[in-house]
Interface confidence: low
C-alpha cells in the first residue's frame, strides 16, 4: 500500500495521528505505521526515535514501553523504517493528542454521551489502529 | 503487466448513484492501496479517497463523506467506488490508480449527470 | 484543508529553454509530488518525495524544495513534454493538488 495512485515504496502517509487518553499503558496498541511493502520483497525492520517510550512490531504497530501520562513531550516523534539489504532508510512522524475529557456537567446532561465519546477503537474503518492481517 | 480496467462510462439522472469497478491484474491486489480520483472537463485533479483491501480499510476525502463508498472484492482483485446523490457537477472522469513506482491508472471513466 | 498554488499558470518556452514550475503550500508539508498529464491521458508521476525521479522519467526532470515552497525543474525542454504539470501533497488529508501549470512548446 502506499502514496496516491501508485504504491510507492515508503509509508503511506507523511504523517500519522492518533487521539490517546490521558494515561498511556505499558505495551497499549497506538496505531499502525505499516510500511508500504509495494513489491513484497523487501525486508524491513522498524525503529522509533523514542525507544524508552515508544516500539514498533514487524506488523508496524506502534506500542507503549511504557506506562505515562501522555502529555507535548511525547507528542510528535519519529519512526524509522529500513531496508534490511539495501539499507535504504524512511521515516514518519508520528503526532499523539490528547482525548477531550468530559467535565462533571456534560456526563450529567447525558448518560449516553461516553458512549459516544469513548467508541471501542478497533473496529472496521478505524484506520491506523487496525491489526494486519496476514 | 500490471493493468487497471475500469468500467464503461455512465450516464446518471441528478439524484441517482453510481459504481464504478476497478479490475487489477498484474500483480497482489492485496499488496497495494486503491485511490479513486476524478476530474471534471477542463479542471485539475481531485483525491477522493483509498482503500486499503489488505486489511479493508478506508481514507475519504471529507467533501465527499456520506456519498462515497470505496470496497474491493480480492477474490476478483477488483476496487469499487460508488458515489450517490449525484449533482451534475459529479461529472468528470474517474480514475482509479494503485501500483508500485511505475505509477498505474485505470483508463478513465466518464460519469455524466444530466437530467 | 491544505491549499497548493502554482505558479505560472501556463509558461510558454522554445525546445531546449529551461523550465521552472512553482508550488507553494498553505501550510508546511513534508514533501512533494509532480505529476504530468496530457490531453486525454491519466496523469503519470514524475517526481516522489519532492526530490526522486520516478522510474522511466528522464533527468531532464528534478524536484526540490522543502516546507511550503517547491519547484519542478525540466532543464531543457523536448517537444514532447508539453503537458500540464500538477503538484500533490500528502501530508494532510485530503491530499490536494495544485491546480496546474500548462508548458506549451513554441
Known amino acids: 500500500s502506499g502514496e496516491i495512485a501508485l504504491c510507492k515504496t515508503g509509508f503511506p502517509e507523511d504523517v500519522y495521528s492518533a487521539v490517546l487518553s490521558k494515561d498511556v499503558h505499558e505495551g497499549q496498541p497506538l496505531l499502525n505505521v505499516k510500511f508500504s511493502n509495494c513489491n513484497g520483497k523487501r525486508k524491513v525492520q522498524y525503529e522509533s526515535s523514542e525507544p524508552a517510550d515508544f516500539k514498533v512490531d514487524e506488523d508496524g504497530m506502534v506500542y507503549a514501553v511504557r506506562s505515562f501520562p501522555l502529555s507535548s513531550e511525547h507528542a510528535k516523534f519519529l519512526i524509522y523504517a529500513q531496508d534490511k539489504e539495501t539499507q535504504e532508510k524512511w521515516q514518519v512522524a508520528v503526532k499523539l493528542s490528547l482525548k477531550p475529557t468530559l467535565t462533571e456537567e456534560s456526563v450529567k446532561e447525558s448518560a449516553e454521551v461516553e458512549e459516544i465519546v469513548f467508541p471501542r477503537q478497533f473496529s472496521k474503518h478505524s484506520g491506523h489502529l487496525q491489526r494486519q492481517k496476514r | 503487466q500490471v493493468q487497471l480496467v475500469q468500467s464503461g462510462a455512465e450516464v446518471k439522472k441528478p439524484g441517482a448513484s453510481v459504481q464504478v469497478s476497478c479490475k487489477a491484474s498484474g500483480y497482489t491486489f492485496t499488496s497495494y492501496l486503491m485511490h479513486w480520483l476524478r476530474q471534471a472537463p477542463g479542471q485539475g485533479l481531485e483525491w477522493m479517497g483509498y482503500?486499503?483491501?489488505?486489511?479493508?480499510?478506508?481514507k475519504y476525502n471529507e467533501k465527499f463523506k456520506g456519498r462515497v463508498t470505496m470496497t474491493s472484492d480480492t477474490s476478483i482483485s477488483t476496487a469499487y467506488m460508488e458515489l450517490s446523490s449525484l449533482r451534475s457537477d459529479d461529472t468528470a472522469v474517474y480514475y482509479c490508480?494503485?501500483?508500485?513506482?511505475?505509477?498505474?491508472w485505470g483508463q478513465a471513466t466518464l460519469v455524466t449527470v444530466s437530467s | 484543508e491544505l491549499v497548493l498554488t502554482q505558479s505560472p499558470g501556463t509558461l510558454s518556452l522554445s525546445p531546449g529553454e529551461r523550465a521552472t514550475l512553482s508550488c507553494r503550500a498553505s501550510s508546511s508539508v513534508n514533501y512533494m509530488y509532480w505529476y504530468q498529464q496530457k490531453p486525454g491521458q491519466a496523469p503519470r508521476l514524475l517526481i516522489y518525495?519532492?526530490?526522486n525521479l520516478a522510474p522511466g522519467i528522464p533527468d531532464r526532470f528534478s524536484g526540490s524544495g522543502s516546507g511550503t515552497d517547491f519547484t519542478l525543474t525540466i532543464s531543457s525542454l523536448q517537444p514532447e513534454d508539453a503537458a500540464t504539470y500538477y503538484c500533490q501533497q500528502f501530508s494532510s488529508p485530503p491530499f490536494t493538488f495544485g491546480q496546474g501549470t500548462k508548458l506549451e512548446i513554441k
Open positions: 518525495y519532492t526530490s
Open positions: 482503500i486499503n483491501p489488505y486489511i479493508d480499510v478506508t
Open positions: 490508480a494503485g501500483g508500485d513506482y511505475e505509477d498505474y
